[in-house]
């Protein structure tokens, strides 16, 4: 699996999850989240050659098409597969509220 | 929706489904499919700016991050959303077989 366990401990050039820290204020302009100040969102990056963690029959077809037509702009793309929630603290007036923001952290990637 | 109805009739620069015809022999090297000889597979292409058909909360975050950090390599990618099957004819010996190959045709795209 192209997950954090594999990708963070390797020098994989193909599609893999990469480390990315996002600061809510600096990187998103969000002031409403009190905690955390930022988080490890991660992101997916790398080429998707034929047979590399392909998502669907279509992805396989497109990767093979790309192999036969190297100059083509049609190619599978490395995108998130498994996403995890992020617990946050925000304020409603003076009252702190805890909430889980779903689908915020990338744990693994796939070629789609 | 970024589907064939919208995308094929517009000059949309952002993420949209694009026309792509794949010839099984020429483009994939597949000789086993008797009919059809090829098909309109289509593909997804175009940038994914903030608020453009974003798939998850993470996609929104990443698009916003990209807006604040234009040089960053972390950005959402335009990938298939709705896929349709393709009926094919192939031979087992001299006997023709009809089968549906699932997830072969892109009908719409999303930013993931």
């Amino acid at each position: 699996a192209l997950d954090t366990n594999y990708c963070f401990s390797s020098t994989e050039k193909n599609c893999c999850v990469r480390q990315l820290y996002i600061d809510f204020r600096k990187d998103l302009g969000w002031k409403w989240i009190h905690e955390p100040k930022g988080y490890h969102a991660n992101f997916c990056l790398g080429p998707c050659p034929y047979i590399w963690s392909l998502d669907t029959q279509y992805s396989k077809v497109l990767a093979l098409y790309n192999q036969h037509n190297p100059g083509a702009s049609a190619a599978p793309c490395c995108v998130p597969q498994a996403l995890e929630p992020l617990p946050i603290v925000y304020y409603v007036g003076r009252k702190p509220k805890v909430e889980q923001l779903s689908n915020m952290i990338v744990r693994s990637c796939k070629c789609s | 929706a970024l589907d064939t109805n919208y995308c094929f009739s517009s000059t949309e620069k952002n993420c949209c489904v694009r026309q792509l015809y794949i010839d099984f022999r020429k483009d994939l090297g597949w000789k086993w499919i008797h009919e059809p000889k090829g098909y309109h597979a289509n593909f997804c292409l175009g940038p994914c700016p903030y608020i453009w058909s974003l798939d998850t909360q993470y996609s929104k975050v990443l698009a916003l991050y990209n807006q604040h950090n234009p040089g960053a390599s972390a950005a959402p990618c335009c990938v298939p959303q709705a896929l349709e099957p393709l009926p094919i004819v192939y031979y087992v010996g001299r006997k023709p077989k009809v089968e549906q190959l699932s997830n072969m045709i892109v009908r719409s795209c999303k930013c993931s």
């Epitope: 204020r25 009190h34 905690e35 100040k37 617990p87 | -």
Partner: antibody, heavy 117, light 103 residues
Amino acid sequence: EVQLVQSGAEVKKPGASVKVSCKTSGYTFISSWMNWVRQAPGAGLDWMGQIYPGDGDTNYNGKFKGRVTLTADTSTSTAYMELSSLRAGDIAVYYCARHYDGSTDYWGQGTLVTVSS
Amino acid sequence: EIVMTQSPASLSLSQGEKVTITCRASENIYSNLAWYQQRPGQAPKLLIYAATNLADGVPSRFSGSGSGTDFSLTISSLEPEDVAVYYCQHFWGTPYTFGQGTK
């Protein structure tokens, strides 16, 4: 290299105010929260508050009852902590510390504030 | 405010021994916890952030575990330079309180 360099030791009279500076270098000052922590002699660590230099937003520890004011000068990348109405219980070493990734990763060397009549 | 309770208050051990210090939060803080080492006359030094992540330049004999309300710092094999006071601190809503320290 990230550095936080604090101003020198201070001796103040009871009721007076003290302003401690924390000059930073080696990172983007405006986009990291700066925390202030104090430590009385032989005691533990006490979080006082934080400031976001980019817009001046602050969060304070209520136990200091409005006696603490945090400011930042973005032109010199310097953070300041002012403590008013000083009393004997305020004798401590005061630290500035950069906030990063759910921690304070870089600390100043500390500034000793003594209150004596 | 969130109260951080650290134990034990002090430890006396020999070189090469394994040490575990615990820290309990009065409410769920998820993984928003850091551990620091403070040697006499020095500023605190970050050891562990986000409960389990080793800070840059920190020897691998240090490790952190836990989430929610119960956390621990482990030193797998004590070295003489590990003589210090160790503090935990939460980062789940201000004020960011510290544990009382383990000497």
